[in-house]
């Protein structure tokens, strides 16, 4: 990882300090949270297995407007090796299940400390 | 209020199998981790696994091969069993609750523990 | 796995000192260590976690600092209630595993 999705950095970003950033990210909206996050916004749920980070930012890139999750957004394009636009699926979509944006902060949250606790960052 | 509370053997033979049950109050098993902790007599703490919020486990990988973790949320209950049981694995046996809602993890409500003696 | 190192293993100490211990880690944890206190006979109590937030009900004479590899556990003025051992804890990586304890006993 050069770069995590737009975040100045003198060099490359160790995986494991990439992905410690994203999990603390994510605690921090969870910790957050007052009113419904994202206005209560419905995004598709993804299969957590490989590729989910691309497939993860698919999802939350479908929410417009919501401040809480844009640094989410450019932490996971930093994980992602393709450019990812709204609109755009892949097939880690479980695509007849919607899910509240916070629960699948803290749905990717879990599965992402239990990847960081096994030392797995790529 | 959270409360956590172990209950099993006191005393296994070695080579037996020990089976542990963590009763919990006060919080859902499906939005807190559980965690397993023993402590031999005057030593220190060893971590032994956990039960996480989905249902899911992870193991210290030392003990890996002799331990399960399951669960009955109906029940509030998290199991611990330990095979092929060992002198040196008498200790004092400790769940926890997780604190969650952090990115480490760390135990903040421990139940009262039991000792549990491995002798023939 | 990451080792943890207290020192001293054990100091006397008279109510009303500053108490200060410390905790050594084998790698890098960041910031995610824990301090727990526990008396005989009875479980651990957590103190602190991610290396100074303090536990609710906690005594504000407990604090935590550091970062990286090094952390420090300190008791701003001893109380009789304090004698016990301590430990410390890293939350980083999977084993999770604790310092060797630290036993604070009355001079």
């Known amino acids: 990882l050069t770069c995590l999705g737009g975040f100045a950095s003198p060099g490359p970003v160790p995986p494991s300090t990439a992905l410690r950033e994203l999990i603390e990210e994510l605690v921090n909206i969870t910790q957050n949270q007052k009113a419904p996050l994202c206005n209560g916004s419905m995004v598709w749920s993804i299969n957590l297995t490989a590729g989910m980070y691309c497939a993860a930012l698919e999802s939350l890139i479908n929410v417009s407007g919501c401040s809480a999750i844009e640094k989410t957004q450019r932490m996971l394009s930093g994980f992602c090796p393709h450019k990812v636009s709204a609109g755009q699926f892949s097939s880690l979509h479980v695509r007849d299940t919607k899910i509240e944006v916070a629960q699948f902060v803290k749905d990717l949250l879990l599965h992402l400390k239990k990847l960081f606790r096994e030392g797995q960052f790529n | 209020q959270v409360t956590l509370k172990e209950s099993g053997p006191v005393l296994v033979k070695p080579t037996e199998t020990l089976t542990l049950t963590c009763t919990v109050s006060g919080f859902s098993l499906t939005n807190y981790h559980v965690q397993w902790i023993r402590q031999p007599p005057g030593k220190a703490l060893e971590w032994l696994g956990v039960m996480w919020s989905d249902g899911d486990t992870s193991f210290n990988s030392v003990l890996k091969s002799r331990l399960t973790i399951s669960r009955d949320t109906s029940k509030s209950q998290v199991v611990l069993t330990m095979t092929n049981m060992d002198p040196v694995d008498t200790a004092t046996y400790y769940c926890?609750?997780?604190?969650?809602?952090?990115?480490?993890?760390?135990?903040?409500?421990w139940g009262q523990g039991t000792l549990v003696t491995v002798s023939s | 796995d990451i080792q943890m190192t207290q020192s001293p293993s054990s100091l006397s100490a008279s109510v009303g000192d500053r108490v200060t211990i410390t905790c050594l880690a084998s790698?890098?944890?960041?910031?995610?260590l824990a301090w727990y206190q526990q008396k005989p006979g009875k479980a651990p109590k957590l103190l602190i976690y991610h290396t100074s937030r303090l536990q609710d009900g906690v005594p504000s004479r407990f604090s935590g600092s550091g970062s990286g590899t090094d952390f420090t556990l300190t008791i701003s003025s001893l109380q009789p209630e304090d004698f016990a051992t301590y430990y410390c804890?890293?939350?980083?990586?999977?084993?999770?595993?604790f310092g060797g304890g630290t036993k604070v006993e009355i001079k």
């Open positions: 926890a609750r997780d604190g969650t809602i952090a990115a480490m993890d760390y135990f903040d409500y």
């Open positions: 804890q890293q939350g980083y990586r999977f084993p999770l595993t």
């Open positions: 790698e890098d944890i960041s910031n995610y």
